[in-house]
Interface confidence: low
């Protein structure tokens, strides 16, 4: 039975040219996280494996940095980065948990960074 829940930074906004941290946190389960996939719509951005570390997709390696923790840092943001991002937690023995973040990249300097929990 899957008892866990995913907390995310929710809907966030950031300024064009800046950077943003995408963060998810899995709680309420004793399942072991074996891997976290970060995806943008149907594109794989990065993978963090509990034992084997990070794999950044080649097409994103100049703009994506691993961490902090199991999170992902997006750099040199463009308006085209606006959209849905998913953290997919592969766990054992529970299975897969998915969290959703919506990022809006703004042209102006009035972007606000929303967060539902403290980023470690």
């Amino acid at each position: 039975m899957m008892t866990g829940t995913i907390e995310t930074t929710g809907n966030i906004s950031a300024e064009k040219g800046g950077s943003i941290i995408l963060q998810c946190h899995l709680s309420s389960t004793t399942a072991q996280v074996t891997q976290v996939n970060w995806e943008q719509q149907d594109q794989l951005l990065a993978i963090c494996n509990a034992d084997l570390g990070w794999h950044i997709s080649p097409s994103f390696k100049d703009r994506v940095a691993p961490g902090p923790g199991l999170g992902l840092t997006l750099q040199s943001l463009t308006v085209n980065d606006t959209g849905e991002y998913f953290c997919i937690y592969h766990t054992y023995p529970d299975g897969t948990y998915t969290g959703r973040i919506f990022l809006e990249v703004l042209e102006s300097s009035v972007a606000e960074h929303g967060a539902r929990f403290q980023i470690p």
């Epitope: 494996n49 509990a50 034992d51 084997l52 570390g53 990070w54 997709s57 080649p58 390696k61 054992y92």
Partner: antibody, heavy 118, light 107 residues
């Protein structure tokens, strides 16, 4: 196409060290973890450890801890495996193997025969 | 460490035969993979994550299993299939181990 090319065969005396190289091409070296596996004559494959070239993180089989050292040179797209205090039972073919996301090794080097003999 | 035991260790079969190789783990594993190795050559990825055929592997090969028991099956053995097959497990904690191999020989 992905290729892993290893250094040539080595003959070493007991107590010596050996350093085997594995040059990767056809992909972005730092995006994939590199493992090392050995196969003694007529024996099963044995996992030695891995290095993650992205951050130089390593993990070793406890059996090889303290004797095996894994390093990488991102600028040369090359991984290295050094084994010290060699003994006759270290005679084996040593392979580098690229780790895939689904926890298996999709490409292997051609192997390097290390012979330990007095 | 998780021990993998393959059976049989070797087998003799004829072209066209159905061949089944089993791999039993000493405790439950997350993933099981299979490799093919020919004499003097490096292993090749053959089946990943229990049942996914690697690129270029013929559809006469299949894999199945869960928990501690896994199988590789060749539905109709062909001359190029004569080789040694190894299972390999991935579980949460290393070391990641291999079976002792099953040598498929011509009868």
């Amino acid at each position: 196409q992905v290729q892993l090319v290893q250094s040539g065969a080595e003959v070493k005396k007991p107590g010596a060290s050996v350093k085997v190289s594995c040059k990767a091409s056809g992909y972005t070296f730092s995006n994939y973890v590199m493992h090392w596996v050995r196969q003694a004559p007529g024996q099963r494959l044995e996992w030695i450890g891995y290095i993650n070239p992205y951050n130089d993180g390593t993990k070793y089989n406890e059996k090889f801890k303290g004797r095996a050292t894994l390093t990488s040179d991102r600028s040369a797209s090359t991984a290295y495996m050094e084994l010290s205090s060699l003994r006759s039972e270290d005679t084996a073919v040593y392979y580098c193997a690229r780790w895939r996301v689904n926890y298996y090794f999709d490409y292997w080097g051609q192997g390097t025969l290390v012979t330990v003999s007095s | 460490d998780i021990q993998l035991t393959q059976s049989p260790s070797s087998l003799s079969a004829s072209v066209g035969d159905r061949v089944t190789i089993t791999c039993r783990a000493s405790s439950s594993v997350n993933y099981m993979h299979w490799y093919q190795q020919k004499p003097g050559k490096a292993p090749k990825a053959w089946i990943s994550v229990t049942s996914n055929l690697a690129s270029g592997v013929p559809s006469r090969f299949s894999g199945s299993g869960s928990g501690t028991d896994y199988t590789l099956t060749i539905s109709s053995l062909q001359p190029e299939d004569f080789a040694t097959y190894y299972c390999q497990q991935w579980s949460s904690n290393p070391p990641w181990t291999f079976g002792q191999g099953t040598k498929v020989e011509i009868k």
